[in-house]
């Protein structure tokens, strides 16, 4: 699986999850997020050669097409597969609000 | 929606579905597929600017991060959203087989 356990431990050129820390205030300008100050959102990148964690029959066929026809511009792309939520604390006036934001952290990638 | 109805009628630089015809014999070497001779598999391509058909909270946040930090290499990618099957005819010996292959035709795209 192209997950954090594998990808963060290996120098992997092809499609894999990469670490990306986002500071809410500095990177997004979100001063309103009280906690956490930032989080590892991570992202997916790297080429998707034939059969690399193909998501659908289309991505397998497209990967094969791209391999057999290298001049082609069409190829699968490395995108998130499994995502996890992030819990944040913010204030509405003086009232603290705890909210779970879905699909905020990339845990693994696929070729789609 | 970034579907064939919209994308095939507009000169759209950003993420959209693009026409791609695959000839089974010429492009894949699949002489064994009797019918059809080929099909429009299509593919997704184009930049994913902030809020362009974002698939998840992560892709929205990543699109915003990428817009505010243009030097960043992390950005969402344009990938298939809706796919349709393709029915093919092939032979096992002299016995014809009709089979529906799932997820073979891209009908729309998203930024993931």
């Amino acid at each position: 699986a192209l997950d954090t356990n594998y990808c963060f431990r290996n120098l992997e050129e092809n499609c894999c999850v990469r670490p990306l820390y986002i500071d809410f205030r500095q990177d997004l300008g979100w001063k309103w997020v009280h906690e956490p100050k930032g989080y590892y959102a991570n992202f997916c990148s790297g080429p998707c050669p034939y059969l690399r964690s193909a998501d659908t029959t289309h991505s397998t066929v497209l990967g094969l097409y791209n391999t057999l026809n290298p001049e082609a511009s069409a190829s699968p792309c490395c995108v998130p597969q499994d995502l996890e939520p992030l819990t944040i604390l913010y204030y509405v006036g003086r009232t603290p609000k705890v909210e779970q934001l879905s699909n905020m952290v990339v845990k693994s990638c696929k070729c789609s | 929606a970034l579907d064939t109805n919209y994308c095939f009628r507009n000169l759209e630089e950003n993420c959209c579905v693009r026409p791609l015809y695959i000839d089974f014999r010429q492009d894949l070497g699949w002489k064994w597929v009797h019918e059809p001779k080929g099909y429009y598999a299509n593919f997704c391509s184009g930049p994913c600017p902030y809020l362009r058909s974002a698939d998840t909270t992560h892709s929205t946040v990543l699109g915003l991060y990428n817009t505010l930090n243009p030097e960043a290499s992390a950005s969402p990618c344009c990938v298939p959203q809706d796919l349709e099957p393709l029915t093919i005819l092939y032979y096992v010996g002299r016995t014809p087989k009709v089979e529906q292959l799932s997820n073979m035709v891209v009908k729309s795209c998203k930024c993931s």
Epitope: L51, T57, T60, V61, L64, L68 | R25, D27, L28, G29, W30, K31, W32, I88, Y90, K97, E99, L101
Partner: nanobody, 118 residues
């Protein structure tokens, strides 16, 4: 279940030759996409060559030295490796991608070791 079995690996001197064989289940071989991949220690698995019907392609690093061929009567795909170099040392894996039928999917062999050393 599709069976994929490699053979033919071994120790060879630089400049030498080896021929790897990969047998796959007869019921799916004729429409399978057959591929050879390799994985060197500490490196990622990489594509070496593909035979897709009557189309074939090679990794740049082996072009002109390796030849993939298939014998549909024997349900076997071969990888003829000539002018071998030390950097060709790796475990070589055969893959069968079956696009149709009840066995649809991709299947891997266990791998065969190729060592190029003097």
């Amino acid at each position: 279940e599709v069976q994929v079995v490699e053979s033919g690996g071994g120790l060879v001197q630089p400049g030498g030759s080896l021929r790897l064989s990969c047998a796959a289940s007869a019921s799916v071989f004729s429409w399978s996409v057959m591929g050879w991949f390799r994985q060197a220690p500490g490196k990622q698995r990489e594509l070496v060559a593909i035979s897709s019907g009557d189309r074939e392609t090679y990794a740049d690093s082996v072009k002109g030295r390796f030849t993939i061929s298939r014998d549909n009567a024997k349900n076997t795909v071969y990888l003829q490796m000539d002018t071998l170099k030390p950097e060709d040392t790796a475990v070589y894996f055969c893959n069968a991608y079956v696009p149709v039928g009840e066995s649809r999917g991709d299947y891997w062999g266990q791998g065969t070791q190729v060592t190029v050393s003097s």
